[in-house]
């Protein structure tokens, strides 16, 4: 019995004065608590307590489930306990079935004995399995069996408590260990897509999987910058033991302008949080915009190839696409697809292949594109360079030497003079009167240009060169003078 | 005996946080796990979530998750259920219930939220 | 998660006769033979009552007309001889694996 200093409170004193007492089954159990300030007897097994106000407790009969702590507590809040075994050869065990572990933790296996002589107080596999290699534990009679540091792999592990009782093995009844698992990283959380575009009244639904050890991982969605709480609905899996899915879907049945955002999918569980997110982008209605990926004005020379091309960005997508030319479409020379294979691709691109171009072909080709909200056109202006062709030559009445060329860009014509029978003309000859012919017609196409000269001005043989020539390249018509006295006898024209 | 007195009925506006409370004994308070059961008026029993013995984990239903949290205060023997963010159907009695040997042994008295306007 | 089916929603039995109520579960609850399934009985304005425990143990204090079998998916809750203080609605409730569930409850009457 404890002893303290006379003046001092004292703890209340038991009878018997034992630590532990053990009685039959069916014997009567009597301990007396003496204090002059006795408050209440307490009574404790497998953690649950009864209680009595008298300071004499006396079970007449007792039995198994009457083994535990009995602890007098007197006015000063002082205690002392006893511990008393009900042997029961029948019950050697007090359970409590419930039997969860902690990853990494230890457990207690509540199995406390009802006898202390047994031996060989230990754990064992049901069935006769042999407990895991690494399975760690201490006995202790009166509370049972304490696992330590509990594996993921004990998970459902069947166990029973066994003692030795006259040399034969005794098992407990069943226990199931259920292990929940340390978190040992952060969730891992993906999003099906990272963003959208809708138009408004349409539907916006987002799906966030989550990815651990358990169901107890925390997830929600956010809005950016917003504390508003987001209407989510779930779904999970468990794919066999610690491989936890949930899918939590964000919905707004009628997305508007103002629900454009970023939306935050956050995780988190003991261990750390992770998060992904999507954007989310609501047009008041569907749009087209056109971007040329060459200049909208093209020149090509005569007889080659061109590739008109554009991207464009549609939402919703397109439906009609066409490339036009002076009022006909084209049924083929053209390709269109979208620019990537991603589900939310809103950019195309469309190409037309213009091959060998006639300078015949120049014009405006448009590309017109539609879907159920908009139409868009673009166009390009195709300018075929030509080499300058000269149309006419000729003397005129009033005795003017005339060249007419055409060609794109529009042609210069010189005039050169060569004496007597040379074809290497040198000096120029200013011409009288320059026009271009066609400036108030059609802006595509070869432009014509016509010059003419004072043929008066020659005194002598000789050859009159009439050049045209442009960017693309030259052709020269020539007029031959041959002089019988005073007379031009006459003018012979070739090119 | 263990016993387990649940707070008082609780009247909420939507939108609103209720925090019920559970104060037990007759046992170790520490030493079980504590779960949260609730029942819509005429409907059946429908499980929230559980406080674990020992170190406080918890594990909720999946329809609760974000929105219920289960704590213990180790020194009044006191668990607590807090459901935010109420609704017209959060209308229900709300249990505690003490696990014991794999069954719910012993339960609250029971709490009844009211969600109006 | 879980799902627990309970059959019949509602039961009128004679006083005297047989009650019984069944309850599957959509994957088994049992582990190495135990089977984590429970019955429990409600009262209007009380709060349930454990009846049966694991499937066929008979809780301390419940009369011994109540009895549970089965094992797997398939369990059975029956009372040999119905009783007046026996009307109430009875549930079915699984703790194999978190969630916890119950059945959807049979209210039990008399004919």
């Known amino acids: 019995q404890p002893s303290v200093s006379p003046g001092e409170p004292s703890p209340p004193s038991i009878h018997p004065g034992k630590s532990d007492l053990i009685v039959r089954v069916g014997d009567e159990i009597r301990l007396l608590c003496t204090d002059p300030g006795f408050v209440k007897w307490t009574f404790e097994i497998l953690d649950e307590t009864n209680e009595n106000k008298q300071n004499e407790w006396i079970t007449e009969k007792a039995e198994a489930t009457n083994t535990g702590k009995y602890t007098c507590t007197n006015k000063h809040g002082l205690s002392n306990s006893i511990y008393v075994f009900v042997r029961d050869p029948a019950k050697l065990f007090l359970v409590d079935r419930s039997l969860y572990g902690k990853e990494d933790n230890d457990t207690l296996v509540r199995c406390p004995l009802t006898d202390p002589e047994v031996t060989n107080y230990s754990l064992k596999g049901c069935q006769g399995k042999p407990l895991p290699k690494d399975l760690r534990f201490i006995p202790d009679p009166k509370a049972g069996i304490m696992i330590k540091s509990v594996k993921r792999a004990y998970h459902r592990l069947c166990l029973h408590c066994s003692v030795d009782q006259e040399g034969k093995s005794v098992l407990s009844e069943k226990f199931i260990l259920k292990v929940r698992p340390a978190f040992k990283a952060v969730p891992v959380v993906s999003v099906s897509k990272a963003s959208y575009l809708l138009r408004e009244g349409e539907e916006f639904t987002v799906t966030c999987t989550i990815k651990d050890v358990s169901s107890s991982v925390y997830s929600t969605w956010k809005r950016e910058n917003s504390q508003t709480k987001l209407q989510e609905k779930y779904n999970s899996w468990h794919h066999g033991d610690f491989n936890y899915e949930r899918q939590a879907t964000l919905t707004i049945s009628s997305a508007r302008v103002n629900d454009s955002g970023v939306f935050m999918c956050y995780a988190n569980n003991t261990f750390g949080s992770a998060n992904v997110t999507t954007t989310l982008e609501v047009v008041d209605k569907g749009f087209i915009n056109i971007f040329p990926m060459i200049n909208t004005t093209v020149f090509v020379n005569d007889g080659e190839n061109v590739d008109l091309i554009v991207e464009y960005e549609a939402f919703p997508k397109p439906e009609h696409q066409q490339w036009i030319y002076m009022n006909r479409t084209f049924t083929d020379k053209w390709e269109d697809y979208p620019k990537s294979e991603n589900e939310s691709n809103i950019r195309y691109v469309s190409e037309l292949h213009l091959t060998r171009l006639k300078g015949t072909e120049g014009g405006t080709y448009t590309f017109l594109v539609s879907n159920s909200d908009v139409n868009a056109a673009i166009a390009f202006n195709v300018y075929v360079n030509t080499k300058p062709e000269i149309l006419t030559y000729d003397r005129l009445v009033n005795g003017m030497l005339q060249c007419v060329a055409a060609g794109f860009p529009e042609p210069t014509i010189d005039w050169y003079f060569c004496p007597g029978t040379e074809q290497r003309c040198s000096a120029s000859v200013l011409p009288v009167d320059v026009q271009t012919l066609n400036s108030s017609g059609p802006p595509f196409g070869k432009l014509v240009v016509q010059s003419s000269i004072d043929s008066s001005a020659f005194k002598h043989n000789g050859t009159v060169e009439c050049k045209a020539y442009n960017d693309v390249g030259k052709t020269s018509a020539y007029f031959n003078f041959a002089f019988k006295g005073n007379n031009k006898e006459q003018i012979h024209p070739h090119t | 005996q263990v016993q387990l007195v649940q707070s008082g009925a609780e009247v909420k506006k939507p939108g609103a946080s209720v925090k019920v409370s559970c104060k037990a004994s007759?046992?170790?308070?520490?030493?079980?796990?504590m779960h949260w059961v609730r029942q819509a008026p005429g409907q059946g029993l429908e499980w929230m979530g559980v406080?674990?013995?020992?170190?406080?984990?918890?594990s909720y239903a999946q329809k609760f998750q974000g929105r219920v949290t289960i704590t213990a205060d180790k020194s009044t023997s006191t668990a607590y259920m807090e459901l935010s963010s109420l609704r017209s159907e959060d209308t229900a009695v709300y249990y505690c219930?003490?696990?014991?040997?794999?069954?719910?042994?012993?339960w609250g008295q029971g709490t009844l939220v009211t969600v109006s306007s | 998660d879980i799902v627990m089916t309970q059959s019949p929603d509602s039961l009128a039995v004679s006083l005297g006769e047989r009650a019984t109520i069944n309850c599957r579960a959509s994957?088994?609850?049992?582990?190495?033979?135990?089977?984590?399934m429970h019955w429990y009985q409600q009262k209007p304005g009380q709060p349930p009552k454990l009846l049966i425990y694991?499937?066929?143990n008979l809780e301390s204090g419940v009369p011994d007309r109540f009895s549970g079998s089965g094992s797997g998916t398939d369990f059975t809750l029956t009372i040999s001889s119905l009783q007046a203080e026996d009307v109430a609605v009875y549930y079915c409730?699984?703790?194999?694996?978190?969630?916890?569930?119950f059945g959807g409850g049979t209210k039990v009457e008399i004919k």
């Open positions: 219930a003490r696990e014991r040997d794999t069954r719910f042994g012993n």
């Open positions: 007759g046992y170790t308070f520490t030493s079980y796990n």
């Open positions: 406080i674990y013995s020992g170190n406080g984990d918890t």
């Open positions: 994957e088994s609850v049992d582990i190495y033979g135990q089977s984590f």
């Open positions: 694991l499937a066929s």
């Open positions: 409730q699984q703790n194999n694996e978190d969630p916890y569930t």
